[in-house]
């Protein structure tokens, strides 16, 4: 009779994490008598995975009934596979011996590869806000995937970015891997509604990549532009001065009126109007009683936006051009901001 051979028909098996791996093994003969053992790896450091005769192997089940006299199928199933189970598995036939069984024949080995999905990419931006024309960095991280091959792309509003650096760790071998990428993005004034997207493609995702997003509204600060204008009022001794605060983001803004350098009124932007690009406009006005002034008045609109140093715009009010009203000593009326959208 021909000598027993141990057949492992599958050179490799690919299993998704969490699933069950089937490792096939058959013997070509019932002789010699003796048990089968499964090992991961070879040589003196090999690891026993299953022993037909003794031991407790809770994750391993046999495909067929090994207690049947004429059984020659020694295939096993390993449940709840993790990336740590990857390796080459050998089905080894032992010959009955005294006192110990003797290794007789080994199969050629089956390489078990484990696929694990990457975690959802997490995109994070800079800690502090930045203004248009500045370059900011965004990071994207995803973990726990196997095999190591992975593709990462960056997009801004659907347009692919090219200025980024990506690392997959560790450099050497591991049961699973992580990816870390940093992209540089140049901010524009129109970026309040913009999104930065990190897209990760991996063999486990069946062509449906995972995406992580960051809204540039969390990152950008658009400083306001100021315009101070003077409008005539029906009452001859009064002038209405408006300060138009345009195209700012975020909304946090405080405005102070100064008359000849002295604080006249401070207010916080409340009812603002939103532009299509996500920035805000706001207008504040000041009613100045020119008859209270002997000399020309320097009116200053000073704006502190989002905790940044104040910016200001001044307007010189010529008193000599207006008739004086006797007995009035009020410099300016404490009027609120104009809530109408002037655009």
């Amino acid at each position: 009779e021909e000598e027993l051979q141990v057949i492992q028909p599958d050179k490799s098996v690919l299993v998704a994490a969490g699933e069950t791996a089937t490792l096939r093994c058959t013997a070509t003969s019932l002789i010699p008598v003796g048990p089968i053992q499964w090992f991961r790896g070879a040589g003196p450091g090999r690891e026993l995975i299953y022993n037909q005769k003794e031991g407790h192997f809770p994750r391993v089940t046999t495909v067929s009934d090994l207690t049947k006299r004429n059984n020659m199928d020694f295939s096993i199933r390993i449940g709840n596979i993790t990336p740590a189970d990857a390796g080459t598995y050998y089905c080894v036939k032992f010959r009955k011996g005294s006192p110990d069984n003797v290794e007789f024949k080994s199969g050629a080995g089956t390489e078990l590869s484990v696929r694990a999905k990457p975690s959802a990419p997490v995109v994070s931006g800079p800690a502090a806000r930045a203004t248009p024309q500045h370059t900011v960095s965004f990071t994207c991280e995803s973990h726990g995937f196997s095999p190591r091959d992975i593709t990462l792309k960056w997009f801004k509003n659907g347009n692919e970015l090219s200025d980024f650096q990506t690392n997959v760790d560790p450099v050497g071998e591991s049961v699973s891997y992580s990816i870390h990428s940093t992209a540089k993005v140049v901010l524009t004034r129109e970026d309040v509604h913009s999104q930065v997207i990190c897209e990760v493609a991996h063999v486990t995702l069946q062509g449906d990549p995972l995406r992580g997003t960051a809204n540039l509204s969390e990152t950008i600060r658009v400083p306001p532009t100021l315009e101070v204008t003077q409008q005539p009022v029906r009452a001859e001794n009064q002038v209405n001065v408006t300060c138009q605060v345009r195209k700012f983001y975020p909304q946090r803004l405080q405005l102070t009126w100064l008359e000849n350098g002295n604080v006249s009124r401070t207010e916080t932007a409340s009812t603002v109007t939103e532009n299509k690009d996500g920035t805000y406009n706001w207008m504040s006005w000041l009613l100045v009683n020119v008859s209270a002034h002997r000399d020309d008045v320097k009116l200053t609109c000073q704006v502190e936006h989002d905790g940044q140093p104040a910016v200001s715009k001044s307007h010189d009010l010529k008193v000599s051009a207006h008739p004086k009203e006797q007995g009035s000593n009020t410099a300016a009326e404490n009027t609120g901001s104009n809530e109408r959208n002037i655009y």
Epitope: G45, T88, S106
Partner: antibody
């Protein structure tokens, strides 16, 4: 193809610890044994020990109390630490890859580093 | 430990002529699976050893076919069918059946 590169100090003082690192490039650490072998000046080869990719270690019994071999798969490196060195530990130290395809034995030390000379002297 | 003994320890050779090195192990290197755990190495002057033969008779990748290994159990032979100048160096046999791995003392091959 796979290449091995030893690194570490060339001179170690008696009673101190010898530390060497071997960097594996161009290949997989999985399914192989990673060995340290030394050769004293003008003498033959002496196996120090090896580590399997699963972390299991095997040492020369006469050196076991002084030797530790460790593996860092994340960096594709393995290391040798030998404590309490004496002049008798002066040798060329080789790192090497040992194959294992099936069964209990091994299938030849098929890749060797170029070797690093370690002198134990005060 | 398995003791490996080589002979001769020195072998003067003539280029183009055959050469033979013997290696004996203190216990059988033939495993129950039928595999022989005996390897041959060549260490050229100033170089690292290189694997020539594994499993008693299988040539390693890139090794010229003038090198052949034979033997079983405890007695093994490395043959060079036609020695070339580049074959000078020290030849070692080694066993890989069990730890510790052990090597022979080496056979120094030099041109006559």
């Amino acid at each position: 193809q796979v290449q091995l590169q030893e690194s570490g100090p060339g001179l170690v003082k008696p009673s101190e610890t010898l530390s060497l690192t071997c960097t594996v490039s161009g290949g997989s650490i999985r399914d192989y044994y990673w060995s340290w072998i030394r050769q004293p000046p003008g003498k033959g080869l002496e196996w120090i020990g090896f580590i399997y990719y699963n972390g299991r270690t095997f040492y020369q019994s006469s050196l076991k109390s002084r030797v530790t071999i460790s593996l860092d798969t994340s960096k594709n490196q393995f290391s040798l630490k030998m404590t309490s060195v004496t002049a008798a530990d002066t040798a060329v130290y080789y790192c090497a890859r040992v194959r294992a395809y099936s069964g209990i034995g091994l299938d030849g030390t098929d890749v060797w580093g170029q070797g690093t000379t370690v002198t134990v002297s005060s | 430990d398995i003791v490996m003994t080589q002979s001769p320890l020195s072998l003067p050779v003539t280029p183009g002529e055959p050469a033979s090195i013997s290696c004996r192990s203190s216990q059988s290197l033939l495993y129950s699976t039928g595999y022989t755990y005996l390897d041959w190495y060549l260490q050229r002057p100033g170089q690292s050893p290189q694997l020539l033969i594994y499993g008693g008779s299988s040539r390693a990748s890139g090794v010229p076919d003038r090198f052949s290994g034979s033997g079983s159990g405890t007695d093994f032979t490395l043959k060079i069918s036609r020695v070339e100048a580049e074959d000078v160096g020290v030849f070692y046999c080694g066993q890989a059946l069990q730890t510790p791995l052990t090597f022979g003392q080496g056979t120094k091959v030099e041109i006559k």
